[in-house]
Interface confidence: medium
């Protein structure tokens, strides 16, 4: 017979014939023949395969190394890899999250635009006119200058991006 040149979905070509792939969570033990079907076996305790496959070995689950600041966010199954994330105050250095670094702090004159997560660093922004930040922080946003007028006070010292305005009493007009 004319052998197939392409196989259907969830099949693979071998010896000019199509065999069924192994389902996610199982590895290939032996290819099918005319008399025997594809033989697959479940992945072991700390292993996985996440696609229909013909792999003879399962992949090892990722190890979330605490020495690198990592912890398990989601335990792996036979069909999914372990997902690591970083300990509190740290974030991943890459999409694969192979190691962590301490969240960046925003220097005085800069405020937090976006607080860091386990996978993204702190995003800082310069404090615009009318706002300031006088601390180095991974959480603090730029604060608005104090409004002296609403307190019936006057500006005695102008604010900067690092300092608040200083308010003082209004000069009394003499009679």
């Amino acid at each position: 017979p004319e052998p197939p040149t392409a196989c259907r979905e969830k099949q693979y070509l071998i010896n000019s014939q199509c065999c069924s792939l192994c389902q996610p969570g199982q590895k290939l033990v032996s290819d099918c023949t005319e008399f025997t079907e594809t033989e697959c076996l479940p992945c072991g305790e700390s292993e996985f395969l996440d696609t229909w496959n013909r792999e003879t070995h399962c992949h090892q689950h990722k190890y979330c190394d605490p020495n690198l600041g990592l912890r398990v966010q989601q335990k792996g199954t036979s069909e999914t890899d372990t997902i690591c994330t970083c300990e509190e105050g740290w974030h991943c250095t890459s999409e694969a999250c192979e190691s962590c670094v301490l969240h960046r702090s925003c220097s005085p004159g800069f405020g937090v635009k976006q607080i860091a997560t386990g996978v993204s660093d702190t995003i800082c922004e310069p404090c615009p006119v009318g706002f300031f930040s006088n601390v180095s922080s991974a959480f603090e946003k730029c604060h608005p200058w104090t409004s002296c007028e609403t307190k019936d006070l006057v500006v005695q010292q102008a604010g900067t991006n690092k300092t608040d305005v200083v308010c003082g009493p209004q000069d009394r007009l003499r009679a």
């Epitope: 197939p4 005319e34 076996l41």
Partner: antibody, heavy 125, light 112 residues
């Protein structure tokens, strides 16, 4: 139409031989693996043997291994079962059956989709 | 060898009523490729067996849709949604995972 016709059955004494034939028509015989299945009087179905589409691979039930030989002649569209050293317990209706497959992928499996009408073998002294 | 066990061995039915036959295998017929290697065959009185269901749940060509196969691993069921008089005969399950192929003992379906 697709058809399998067995022949060669009969009454035979224990220890003697018999050859069964299965003539195929209506399909490309050389593309299909073929099975022999038997049924003793009043009993269920028992698988006997299978041969690959090209005759290169053969498997047998333990009960017939070493006594029966399955073979085929694709030029004659015919399957055979050579039965030697016959025993009383080989008495049965013998059916040939086609192993169905998808398109031209003869590794795929679609059941034993065509059966012959059967031929009766009686082993008795 | 894989042992196939059917139940019941005899099933009296009423035309128009549903019927169900169970088949159990001594080992899983799901080798990890997503298919269950279990067939159902019907042998009508005085006839050769005929294929009803292959790979657990696929109806063979020309088989009425009142027949359905289900199950996975080691436990399988053949259901007839509404039995007709022509459905009488002996039903066999067969494992197609490995040689030797093995059949269940058969379930005799007869009209009450």
């Amino acid at each position: 139409q697709v058809q399998l016709v067995e022949s060669g059955g009969g009454v035979v004494q224990p220890g003697r031989s018999l050859r069964l034939s299965c003539a195929a028509s209506g399909f490309t015989f050389s593309s299909y693996a073929m099975h022999w299945v038997r049924q003793a009087p009043g009993k269920g179905l028992e698988w006997v043997a299978v041969i690959s589409y090209d005759g290169s691979n053969k498997y047998y039930a333990d009960s017939v291994k070493g006594r029966f030989t399955i073979y085929r002649d694709n030029s004659k569209n015919t399957l055979y079962l050579q039965m030697n050293s016959l025993r009383a317990e080989d008495t049965a209706v013998y059916y040939c059956a086609r192993r169905g497959h998808y398109g031209n992928n003869y590794y795929s499996y679609y059941g034993l989709d065509v059966w012959g009408q059967g031929t009766t073998v009686t082993v008795s002294s | 060898d894989i042992v196939m066990t059917q139940s019941p061995l005899s099933l009296p039915v009423t035309p128009g009523e549903p019927a169900s036959i169970s088949c159990r295998s001594s080992q899983s017929l799901l080798p990890g490729n997503g298919y269950n290697y279990l067939d159902w065959y019907l042998q009508k009185p005085g006839q050769s067996p005929q294929l009803l269901i292959y790979l657990g749940s696929n109806r063979a060509s020309g088989v009425p849709d009142r027949f359905s196969g289900s199950g996975s691993g080691t436990d399988f069921t053949l259901k007839i949604s509404r039995v007709e008089a022509e459905d009488v005969g002996i039903y066999y399950c067969m494992q197609a995972l490995q040689t030797p192929r093995t059949f269940g003992q058969g379930t005799k379906v007869e009209i009450k």
